[in-house]
């Protein structure tokens, strides 16, 4: 299949909300629960998420929310006591009105005339804001993640079903399937749909086989497919790389630990603007590439690629994507050169052969122009020690 066309992208930063909200059928999400299918109900009001009013929370709304989130039906709908004492009971006759302050900041309610999300609407200021909050536990605690890909937007596809994380078999796995994964996770669109062994193999059950998404589904479990079969092994675990995943390389230097900083993001390689490239950013990049620490930041050259990415790190992050970042889609770096770095493991410093990659870092080439770095959890802990 051809790759789904990327949606129009506005300027983006690490502080903004996801490109696609998890509950896009209904402006709702569940928070502070054991999974994405249980917790306190929050509804989206323009730019913010607000806890839904518990006083008007009923079984129809609970059922609709669970269905909309792809979590089966509702197992239990309840109310959570408010974080502060509830407002006093109705005032005695003749008392002056307290409504002005208490109600203008009222809490929204999710009101449903049936158990289907199409029959629901969000009503603003429907309850006093100090009241109880709506909570739900859905019958199917389903969730999705990408693992061992060096970030939340690349890696082996894993689904949570029946309390267990498991893989998806790569039979018939293609860009439409990966696109559904990327969109569901708020990771943009699929850059690559990868067969087994591009990422470390999984260990748990194999939940799905012969997945065949159209690309329009909101959740991977809405796609046609079969339950994981015994003949599908972990050598065939499906993977995905999404447009919002960032991977880095250094080019034009003596080796892979020296050169111009380039980031693969939204399907293309971009240079990084040196106007905000400081020692803390260089340190994070060198360490994440397994190249030691940053020795210097040579003067940059004019941008040979699209230069649109800015980073701001404190120096303690594991990768640049954990830093605050800004991708300017409409303008190339203004009055800026392409950032460069020389890391301590570069052979141009030591006049040695190509540096060994530390055991904690595994580099997997997934196509001629894309490299994804993988760290497993154990080795990351060792590195932190």
């Amino acid at each position: 299949h051809p790759s789904p066309a990327p949606p129009d992208q506005l300027n983006t930063s690490s502080a903004e909300s996801e490109l696609w909200e998890p509950g896009e059928r209904l402006p709702v999400r569940l928070t502070n629960g054991s999974s994405s299918c249980s917790g306190t109900v929050e509804v989206r009001l323009e730019a913010s998420w607000e806890p839904a009013c518990g006083a008007l929370w009923d079984s129809r709304a609970a059922e609709a929310v669970c269905r909309a989130l792809g979590c089966g039906g509702a197992e239990a709908a309840s109310q959570l006591a408010p974080p502060t004492p509830e407002l006093p009971p109705p005032p005695a006759a003749g008392n002056t009105s307290v409504a002005a302050n208490a109600t203008l900041a009222g809490a929204p309610a999710l009101l449903c005339s049936g158990a289907e999300w199409r029959l629901c609407e969000v009503v603003e200021h429907a309850c006093r804001s100090d009241g109880r909050r709506a909570r739900v536990t859905c019958a199917e605690n389903r969730a999705l993640r990408l693992v061992d890909g060096g970030g939340a937007c690349a890696g082996r596809v894993e689904m949570l079903e029946h309390g267990e994380w498991g893989s998806v078999c790569d039979d018939t796995w293609d860009l439409e399937d990966a696109h559904v994964v990327c969109r569901q996770l708020g990771c943009g669109w699929a850059v690559q749909a990868l067969p087994g062994l591009h990422f470390t193999p999984g260990r748990g059950p194999i939940h799905r086989d012969q997945v065949n998404c159209s690309g329009a589904e909101a959740y991977l479990w809405d796609c046609p497919g079969l339950p994981g079969q015994h003949y599908c092994g972990h050598k065939e675990d499906a993977g995905a790389v999404c447009s919002e995943h960032q991977s880095w390389r250094l080019t034009g230097g003596a080796d892979r630990c020296e050169g111009q900083v380039e980031v693969h993001f939204r399907g293309v390689w971009n240079t990084v603007c040196d106007s905000e490239w400081y020692p803390s950013e260089a340190k994070v990049l060198c360490q994440s590439l397994g190249c030691g620490t940053a020795v210097e930041r040579p003067k940059g050259l004019p941008h040979s690629l699209s230069g649109r990415m800015y980073y701001s790190c404190n120096g303690e992050e594991l990768t640049l994507s954990n830093c605050s970042w800004r991708f300017n889609n409409s303008n190339l770096c203004s009055q800026s050169l392409a950032a460069r770095v020389l890391c301590s493991a570069s052979r141009s410093l030591h006049n040695l052969s190509t540096p060994e990659v530390p055991a904690s870092v595994q580099t997997v080439t997934i196509e001629s122009s894309v490299t994804v770095k993988i760290e497993n959890k154990e080795s990351r802990e060792l590195m932190l020690l």
């Epitope: 008007l56 109705p90 006759a93 002056t96 009105s97 009222g106 309610a109 200021h125 006093r128």
Partner: nanobody, 122 residues
Framework: QVQLQESGGGLVQAGGSLRLSCTAS????????LGWFRQGPGKEREFVAA????????YYADSVKGRFTISRDNAKNTLLLQMNSLKPEDTAVYFC????????????????WGKGTQVTVS
């Protein structure tokens, strides 16, 4: 104790209009979210429409959406229900309700009920 008094009911032909009114004795009328419920012959009480304290948010039962309009006038302690394109199935006793904690969409949040006014659509 809030006293709610409905008025404006009566007999009307199908397709016609009626305007129900509810007045409250309470000076702190604006502290309450208000609404209308109805009970048809041999039926359970059902929600019709609700409005929040300041009048900025309204909610309607699917069966009356686009035909009924709820509004309030806090200065006059009055709740109104404009009913257009009436149908025989709208025949019921209409109750004015008041709620302190939330819009009166579900019966368990309602603090006060009026005595009701009869609407008959022939």
């Amino acid at each position: 104790q809030v006293q709610l008094q409905e008025s404006g009911g009566g007999l009307v032909q199908a397709g016609g209009s009626l305007r129900l009114s509810c007045t409250a004795s309470e000076r702190t009328f604006s502290d309450y979210a208000l609404g209308w419920f109805r009970q048809g012959p041999g039926k359970e009480r059902e929600f019709v429409a609700a409005i929040n304290w300041v009048g900025g948010s309204t909610y309607y039962a699917d069966s009356v959406k686009g035909r009924f309009t709820i509004s309030r006038d806090n200065a006059k302690n009055t709740l109104l229900l404009q009913m257009n394109s009436l149908k025989p199935e709208d025949t019921a006793v209409y109750f004015c309700v008041a709620s302190w904690g939330a819009m009166p969409v579900l019966t368990h949040v309602i603090n006060y009920w009026g005595k009701g006014t009869q609407v008959t659509v022939s």
